[in-house]
Structures are given as C-alpha cells and as structure tokens.
Interface confidence: low
C-alpha cells in the first residue's frame, strides 16, 4: 500500500481467482484513543472499533472511503483504491490503446517547436467518475523539472455505438535548452483513477522525436506571365522556433487534382517559394518538416489553383 | 577552417557537408525512428557519446559571442563517431550491404572534422569507449543506437553551420 495523495492510498493486488489479497492497517488521524468506530462509504454498518482497523483487501468491494468517527463526529477519512496486476502486468482498462506508432501506445505527445513545451493526449470510453493527474521530468535518476497543467477533456467523438473522449495536457520543461542535443528523455507519468480503480501510464521520449511543426502560413499563388506555371510562396509558422537561420524547416509542395487517383506532383525545397504547374481544378498544398531531423511532417496548408 | 588563433571556419562548406551528413545518417537507418531503442537496455553503450550540451555555446547567442567553444565540441563529436563507424561494430558481422550509406557517412564525418581542424593543430578528443559486442545481434542493436544518436548530433551541428553561414560568414 502506498499514499497517492493526502488520505488516498493505493493497494496493489495480484488479481486472480481466490487470490489472498493484501492485509491493510488503517489508523485514525486523531489524538483520541477511545470510543472510535469505523464505517465504509455511505454505510452506517460499523466495521470495527479502536484507533486502528485491520482489513483484508481482495476486491473492489473492499475498497472505498473508510471513515473513523467518535460520538457522531467524523475524525478522518482514508480512501482505498485498487491497482490490479494480472499475470504480472498492471491493468490498462481505463485508457484506450491508440496503436500508433506501435501497440500499447496509451499516451501520445507532440511538440510544435524546441521550446520545451509539449502536449500529450489519451483516449478513453469512460465518461464519468474519472480523474487524471500528470507528472513529468527530464530523466529519471536525477530528474530535472517539467511543469504540467491540469488534464482537460479536449474532444468527444462517436465511434460506432461508443463515445470516445480525448483528454490532453500541456507541459513545459522548466529549464529548456532548445539548441542542445537531448541526452536524457522526457518522462511523462499519468495517474488515472476511475471510481475505485487506479492505473498509471508512462511515456518516454526526446522532444526532437515528437516535433510536428504547424502548417506553413500565408500560402499564396502568383501566376507567371504567359505560362501555366505559378509561383507558390509561404512563410514559417508563427509557432516554430527562432531564429529560422538556426531552426530551419524543409518543405514539400504538392499539386493534387480533384480526383484522389490523379497523379500527385511533388517538389521538395528548403526555400519558402517554388514554381509549379497549376492544373485546372487542382489544389496546391505545402507542408513542413525539421530540415535536419526527420520528425513528423506538419499537416498540409492548401490553396485552390483557381 | 577553425584555426588555433580562433578565426572562422568555412561556414558555407561546413553547412553543405553537415546537411549531407544529416541525409546520410537518416538513409543509413531510416526506420530507427519506429524502434524504441531505449527499451532495449544496454544504456552504457551509448552513454559515453559526446553530446552538444546546453553550456557548449552552440545556441545562436553563444555562436555570436564566441563560436570556438561550440566548434570544438562538434569536432570532438565528429572524431568520436568517425572512430565508431570505423570500428568492428560496423566492420564486423553481420556485414553491411555493399551499397550501405555507412561508408559514405564515415567519409563525410572525416571530411567535416578536417574542415574544422587543419593539419598540425589538435583539439583534445574524447576517448572512444571499448565496445566489443560478442554477438552479431548485439552488434546490430549497437549500430542502430549509434546511428540514432548520430542523427541527433548531426542535426545540431547542421543547425550551427546553417546559422553560421547565414549570419557569421565574412
């Protein structure tokens, strides 16, 4: 058993039929010695008396809020949560496996630049009685600070008969050094509590590997005289690291016909302009990627040829 | 060239070669991004590589103040990786494919390090750790890790030279 936060405890249980469970001793936080009784949740049934209560925790029915009282007055509470271990593996019932970029990916994170700010998100089909707490650090043995905000519900989607909820959190490395070569990964730890079930999820990454720039901005077309060619120009996204002479992007320019089957013309360039042939009903799209490190491409910025 | 007196390197040449290094490092092991090599244990094998750290003056401000600190660190790393790519980790079994970019990568590391340091002037270089993996699969894993680490190192070096070429060239 360990303390998650004040008055909230996690009991780790091997989860199999007829498992013996864990013996837990609860102590009433009071100077009183006599006349103390214990109850569980809303029940008025007295579970025991005395300053301590010993219980055998085997299943969710044994978890919950234990309260000690004296003469009708509440003295203190202890909330017991269960963390299940099945076949040596901690349960992952609360969050959905996103399966990208590989199986057992519960947390996904992205950064728009090298400032040390990043966003992580996760999915669940659970809509109520759900809380998340997020901690992060750079490195684990001698951790350096990363400050995370509160996790918030950021999207709701309908998937077949099910509703899916997306939660996200923003974190910022306290002492970020955008120009350095990272040697220790960022660690992200999410505590998830659904009713009386506790689970934890972790992700480990370098900022450089989760970079995904915003799309290029101010995408414009300038027809060239007496020609089907146009000059496409764009700018670095506002959110990208500066100076751009140091944090450089490379770009992919694509001409795409109305039909998805039509051949796509693609040009790669380090400049912020390119000359392409604009076909009727086609559109021109541009996306960006770090010039020197092959992390994710941005989403496309598009403009119609007409 | 970065000479003992501390004059500027050939920023544009360094920029071109370092950008080529980035391309080669990724073509040498493009899929490495989809493998979480940090789960594979064996940390000490890549812990000793020289990283371009926060205080090495490789940020835009540090380069403007005095680029020598940074260039020295980059040179140190280039020599280190050049030695690793020439060691039995890459020359031993399983053999690299004949058209593997590792050979080109090795040559380019040497080329850039020589651009930074003319003959007769020696910056101190870091000792290469003695890594002699016994099993071919260990050697394969070590190659992935070294290339992954090299990708990060040359990205920073390329940024430095691009910025230098744009803002510090005479």
């Amino acid at each position: 058993i360990w303390e998650l936060k004040k008055d909230v405890y996690v009991v780790e249980l091997d989860w199999y039929p007829d498992a013996p469970g864990e013996m837990v001793v609860l102590t009433c936080d009071t100077p009183e010695e006599d006349g103390i009784t214990w109850t569980l949740d809303q029940s008025s049934e007295v579970l025991g008396s005395g300053k301590t209560l010993t219980i055998q925790v085997k299943e969710f029915g044994d978890a919950g809020q234990y309260t000690c009282h004296k003469g009708g007055e509440v003295l203190s509470h202890s909330l017991l949560l269960l963390h299940k271990k099945e076949d040596g593996i901690w349960s992952t019932d609360i969050l959905k496996d996103q399966k990208e970029p590989k199986n057992k990916t519960f947390l996904r994170c992205e950064a728009k630049n090298y400032s040390g700010r990043f966003t992580c998100w996760w999915l669940t089909t659970i809509s109520t009685d759900l809380t998340f707490s997020v901690k992060s650090s750079r490195g684990s043995s001698d951790p350096q600070g990363v400050t995370c905000g509160a996790a918030t519900l950021s999207a709701e989607r309908v998937r077949g008969d099910n509703k899916e909820y997306e939660y996200s959190v923003e974190c910022q490395e306290d002492s970020a050094c955008p120009a350095a070569e990272e040697s220790l990964p960022i660690e992200v730890m999410v505590d998830a509590v659904h009713k009386l079930k506790y689970e934890n999820y972790t992700s480990s990454f370098f900022i450089r590997d989760i970079i995904k720039p915003d799309p290029p901005k101010n995408l414009q077309l300038k027809p060239l005289k007496n020609s089907r060619q146009v000059e496409v120009s764009w700018e670095y996204p506002d959110t990208w690291s500066t100076p751009h002479s140091y944090f450089s992007l490379t770009f992919c320019v694509q001409v795409q016909g109305k039909s998805k089957r039509e051949k796509k013309d693609r040009v790669f360039t380090d400049k912020t302009s390119a000359t392409v042939i604009c076909r009727k009903n086609a559109s021109i799209s541009v996306r960006a990627q770090d010039r020197y490190y092959s992390s994710s491409w941005s989403e496309w910025a598009s403009v119609p040829c007409s | 060239r970065a000479v003992p007196g501390g004059s500027s390197p050939a920023w544009t040449q360094c920029q071109q070669l370092s950008q080529k290094l980035c391309t080669l490092a990724w073509s040498a092991h493009p899929l490495v991004g989809h493998m979480d090599l940090r789960e594979e244990g064996d940390e000490e094998t890549t812990n000793d590589v020289p990283h371009i750290q926060c205080g090495d003056g490789c940020d835009p401000q540090g380069l403007r103040d005095n680029s020598q600190f940074c260039l020295q660190r980059i040179h140190q790393g280039l020599i280190f990786y050049e030695k690793l790519l020439g060691s039995d980790i890459f020359t031993g079994e399983p053999s690299l494919l004949p058209d593997s970019p590792v050979g080109q990568l090795h040559a380019s590391l040497l080329g850039l390090s020589q651009l930074l340091q003319p003959e007769g002037h020696h910056w101190e270089t870091q000792q290469i750790p003695s890594l002699s993996p016994s099993q071919p699969w260990q050697r394969l894993l070590l190659r992935f890790k070294i290339l992954r680490s090299l990708q990060a190192f040359v990205a920073v070096a390329a940024r430095v030279f691009a910025h230098g070429a744009a803002t510090l060239s005479p």
Epitope: D174, S175 | Q53, C54, G55, D56, Q61, G62, N66, F69
Partner: antibody, heavy 121, light 112 residues
C-alpha cells in the same frame, strides 16, 4: 545541505588586485552555471559575471569587462573571481550564486553569505 | 540607471495585496526572456522567490506569484505579512548587453 561560502575579500588600494573564492558543497557543482553578483553599500544588486557548468563559456558585465576574470575548478568545487585594476566603484559585498540550470537564464537559487571588498587609498 | 525599472518603494497593510512592477524593453523581458524575483532582508543574502516568471521554488508560500506581459513583469503578494518587509529585485537576461540584469529593487514597507 546546499551551501556556498565566499572568501578573499578585504581592503585594497585602487589599481591593485584581489582574488575571491567561493566553496560549494551539498550539490553537484560541475552541473551548474555559477554567477558573481555584487551590492555596493546602500545600493541594489549588480550582476558581475557568469561561467557555464564546464567553464567553457564566460560572460561579464560591461563595468568589469577586461578587468575581472571568472573561473572554476570543478575538481575542488570552487568558483573564483580574479579582480584586477580595482577602482573605488568596485567597493561592494560580492556574492557567489548558483544558477538553477547548466547555463544562465533560469534564476539563481542558492546564494553565499557574501564577502566585502573595499577599494580605498 | 538600471536596465529594468522598478519603483523605489511600495507599502501595504497586513492582509492586503501588493504588486511590484518591473519594466524592461524588447531586448530583455520583451524578447521573451524569463523574469526571476528575489527577496532580500537587510544585511542578508538575496533569496530566489520566483523563477521562470511564475514558478515558486519549494518552501516559498503560494501568497507570492509572478506574471509577465509584453516587456513588463510583476510580482504579487497576497495576504501581506509583517515578515514580508524586505527589498524585492527582478532579474532577467538582456540579449543586447549579453548580460544578466537586475532591476534597481523595490523596498516593501508593511504598515501597521
């Protein structure tokens, strides 16, 4: 516990030199940038110099540039400030301070008690 | 003349809220550099109170908070206490001077 102890202050004539030391304990000295900050009698704080965690980068205030040299010996967990060509306006309490990060920019989270330098003829 | 401008003094009664301003320029606070705040009692070394514009080191009460807008920063103390009477300094980095810079300091007087 984390501690910085300055020494080497005293009374010195204008034009002369003085070397201040700062002994660090209770933290990994070689992982942090270190500063010297001074405070003239009845005045505010004035930043003097900083040195990066490994000694490779050093920066100085314009008022001391060319006269003062900051250095460190990581094997001895000691920071130094060599002060040459001292002037009356260098009279102050000199503090050494630990940066929260490897380089400057994250705040000075540990300070010594200060050592007094008086420059007077 | 400090690069960062702070008012020489502010005062407030116990329990009140007081704010300290720190005005810079676009080569320091306005360039996006973090602002740090220090508290100094007479005859004592300064103590880091707020770092990275709005983060409190452990042991600093949550009565102290920092914020930044454009080229200015401010420190706020809520529920003012007699023991808060001290000098308060802001500090940041100036990219033009390539130097760390302090404000001139503000003396806080707790009335009463």
């Amino acid at each position: 516990q984390v501690q910085l102890v300055e020494s080497g202050g005293g009374l010195v004539k204008p034009g002369r030199s003085l070397r201040l030391s700062c002994a660090a304990s209770g933290f990994t000295f070689s992982s942090y940038a270190m500063h010297w900050v001074r405070q003239a009698p009845g005045k505010g704080l004035e930043w003097v110099a900083v040195i990066s965690y490994d000694g490779s980068n050093k920066y100085y205030a314009d008022s001391v540039k060319g006269r003062f040299t900051i250095s460190r010996d990581n094997s001895k967990n000691t920071l130094y400030l060599q002060m040459n060509s001292l002037r009356a306006e260098d009279t102050a309490v000199y503090y050494c301070a630990k940066e929260k990060g490897m380089v400057r920019g994250y705040g000075m989270d540990v300070w010594g008690q200060g050592t007094t330098v008086t420059v007077s003829s | 003349q400090s690069v960062l401008t702070q008012p020489p003094s502010v005062s407030g009664a116990p329990g009140q809220r007081v704010t300290f301003s720190c005005t810079g320029s676009d080569s320091n606070i306005g360039a996006g550099y973090d602002v740090h705040w220090y508290q100094q009692f007479p005859g004592r070394a300064p103590k880091l109170l707020i770092y990275g514009t709005n983060n409190r080191p452990s042991g600093v009460p949550d009565r102290f908070s920092g914020s930044k807008s454009g080229a200015s920063a401010s420190l706020a103390i809520t529920g003012l206490q007699v023991e808060d009477e001290a000098d308060y300094y802001c500090q940041t980095f100036d990219t033009r001077l390539i130097a760390s810079v302090f404000g001139g300091g503000t003396q806080l007087t707790v009335l009463g």
